[in-house]
């Protein structure tokens, strides 16, 4: 019982985790104008890992695609690098944790290949979690880094009198999503790990003893005992389960240039 | 089309207030801004400040915040500029304008000539 | 607060000449996010409300005659008018969309010689 909650757990709980990281990663909200100790602009800038977007005070929104990929900062490549390859393991992982799933009964799938499954599935998600919360990460620093040599030179003087205010960026609401979405994703593997251990089956092999007993000839041959996970191997009463969850990130699409400084 | 249009000229006495009325009509009055901006007898324009009817945000320039308030009526389409304690020196025309994209006025009333004189 | 400075005051231009005005920012008003400058150009005739002429300091806006033009970027920008017409006698403001408050130039008249 407690095996088939922890890895129906783990799997519920990777879903919202990967759910997370796909909507993270089409977000534009990675870093948003910095409006603290800034003058106030009637302009809002805020970026993605895609394309840039203006929204001005009249409540019109811009946004721009980077249609250039060489001309892309190479952290910026990083992250969207370690983004996709967090959603593929964590898609994949989905998918084989469906079919390790043990509330789900296909043919006549060995408890061992349902562990395997399991731990393969776990792995995957471990994995694309770490990968979310360094792309994240990674995309952090280099706004933390930027910030502060923006800061630097936050008032350039041009021709004396005239200044030009530096656009800085800070912690948009994306970076808060990955994190906690591959937080999610993490905690998910590491409790379809847990549960692995539990659905593999112990092999504990005992020699044939025979014991001879006055008048009667009875022979005990206790062997290939299983450890019992406190479930039987009836499957007539059980439900299947499918998962399943989408998440659609709506996001208005208008036809600049990225800016990292 | 769009058209914004504005209450009647108004002659008040130091001290009174006043309330201007601008009645949009040819669009979605929440969609867009309503700013205020002030001329005063054979001067510049003044931006005084602007109201979003959708959200309810107001941002008013330095020179015009506690005398001067902003506020609107969705049912009637209409947004307000109200003037307490007037002086002598907010004898101006002022006029509302619709903010459209690129933070531009595209459409503006016809003004309304306040004059405070005792 | 952003000063946006215009120059001349007045200008005397004649019939079918060019007239040029000047407007200087305090700030750039130049968005990086879009690579656009966020200054306006207002018409305003005797007795009438402004009339928007140009918009992101050089796109024109509709019904507006393409004797008008705006240029410049940054801080210093200009408002073209290439041949005078009669009825273009008006006073002419900059205003910055960029920054609050939204500051308008001092304005510029422009007469015919």
């Known amino acids: 019982m407690a095996v088939t909650a922890c890895q129906g757990l783990g799997f519920v709980v990777s879903l919202i985790g990967i759910a997370g990281i796909i909507a993270a990663t089409c977000m534009d909200q990675w870093s948003t104008q910095d409006l603290y100790n800034n003058p106030v602009t009637a302009v809002f800038n805020y970026q993605g890992l895609w394309r840039s977007c203006v929204r001005e005070s009249s409540g019109f929104t811009e946004c721009r695609g980077y249609f250039t990929l060489l001309g892309l900062p190479a952290m910026l490549q990083a992250v969207r690098a370690l983004m996709i390859v967090g959603i593929v393991l964590g898609a994949i992982g989905l998918l084989v944790s469906i079919f390790a799933l043990k509330c789900i009964r296909i043919g006549s799938m060995e408890d061992s290949a349902k562990a395997n499954m399991t731990l393969t599935s776990g792995i995957m998600f471990i994995v694309s979690g770490l990968c979310a919360i360094a792309g994240v990460s990674v995309f952090a620093n280099m706004l933390v880094t930027n910030f502060w040599m923006s800061t630097a030179n936050m008032y350039t003087g041009m021709g004396g009198m005239v200044q030009t205010v530096q656009t800085r960026y800070t912690f948009g609401a994306a970076l808060f999503v990955g994190w906690v979405a591959g937080g999610l994703t993490l905690i998910g593997g590491v409790m379809m790990c847990i549960a692995c251990r539990g659905l593999a089956p112990e092999e504990t092999n005992y020699k044939a003893v025979s014991y001879h007993a006055s008048g009667h000839s009875v022979a005990y041959k206790p062997g290939g005992f299983k450890a019992s996970t406190g479930f039987g191997s009836n499957t007539k009463n059980k439900k299947i389960y499918d998962g399943g969850a989408r998440t659609e990130d709506e996001v208005q699409s208008y036809p600049s240039k990225h800016d990292y400084v | 089309q769009i058209q914004l249009v504005q209450s009647g000229s108004e002659l008040k006495k130091p001290g009174a207030s006043v309330k201007v009325s601008c009645k949009a009509s040819?669009?979605?009055?929440?969609?867009?801004?309503i700013n205020w901006v002030r001329q005063a007898p054979g001067q510049g324009l003044e931006w005084m400040g602007w109201?979003?009817?959708?959200?309810?945000?107001?941002t008013y320039a330095e020179g015009f915040t506690g005398r001067f308030v902003l506020s609107w009526d969705t049912s009637v389409s209409t947004a307000y500029l109200q003037i307490s304690s007037l002086k002598a020196e907010d004898t101006a025309v002022y006029f509302c304008?619709?903010?459209?994209?690129?933070?531009?006025?595209?459409?503006w009333g016809q003004g309304t000539l306040v004059t405070v004189s005792s | 607060d952003i000063v946006m400075t215009q120059s001349p005051d007045s200008l005397a231009v004649s019939l079918g000449e060019r007239a040029t005005i000047n407007c200087k920012s305090s700030?750039?008003?130049?968005?990086?996010?879009?690579?656009?400058?966020?200054l306006t150009w207002y018409q305003q005739k005797p007795g009438q409300p402004p009339k928007l002429l140009i918009y992101?300091?050089?796109t024109r806006e509709s019904g507006v005659p393409d004797r008008f033009s705006g240029s410049g970027s940054g801080t210093d920008f200009t408002l073209t008018i290439s041949s005078l017409q009669a009825e273009d006698v008006a006073v002419y403001y900059c205003?910055?969309?960029?920054?609050?408050?939204?500051?308008f130039g001092g304005g510029t008249k422009v007469e015919i010689k």
């Open positions: 304008a619709r903010l459209y994209y690129g933070n531009r006025f595209d459409s």
């Open positions: 040819g669009y979605t009055f929440t969609n867009y801004g």
């Open positions: 109201i979003n009817p959708g959200t309810g945000e107001t």
């Open positions: 700030q750039s008003l130049l968005n990086s996010g879009n690579q656009r400058n966020y």
């Open positions: 992101w300091a050089s």
């Open positions: 205003q910055n969309a960029y920054y609050y408050p939204l500051t």
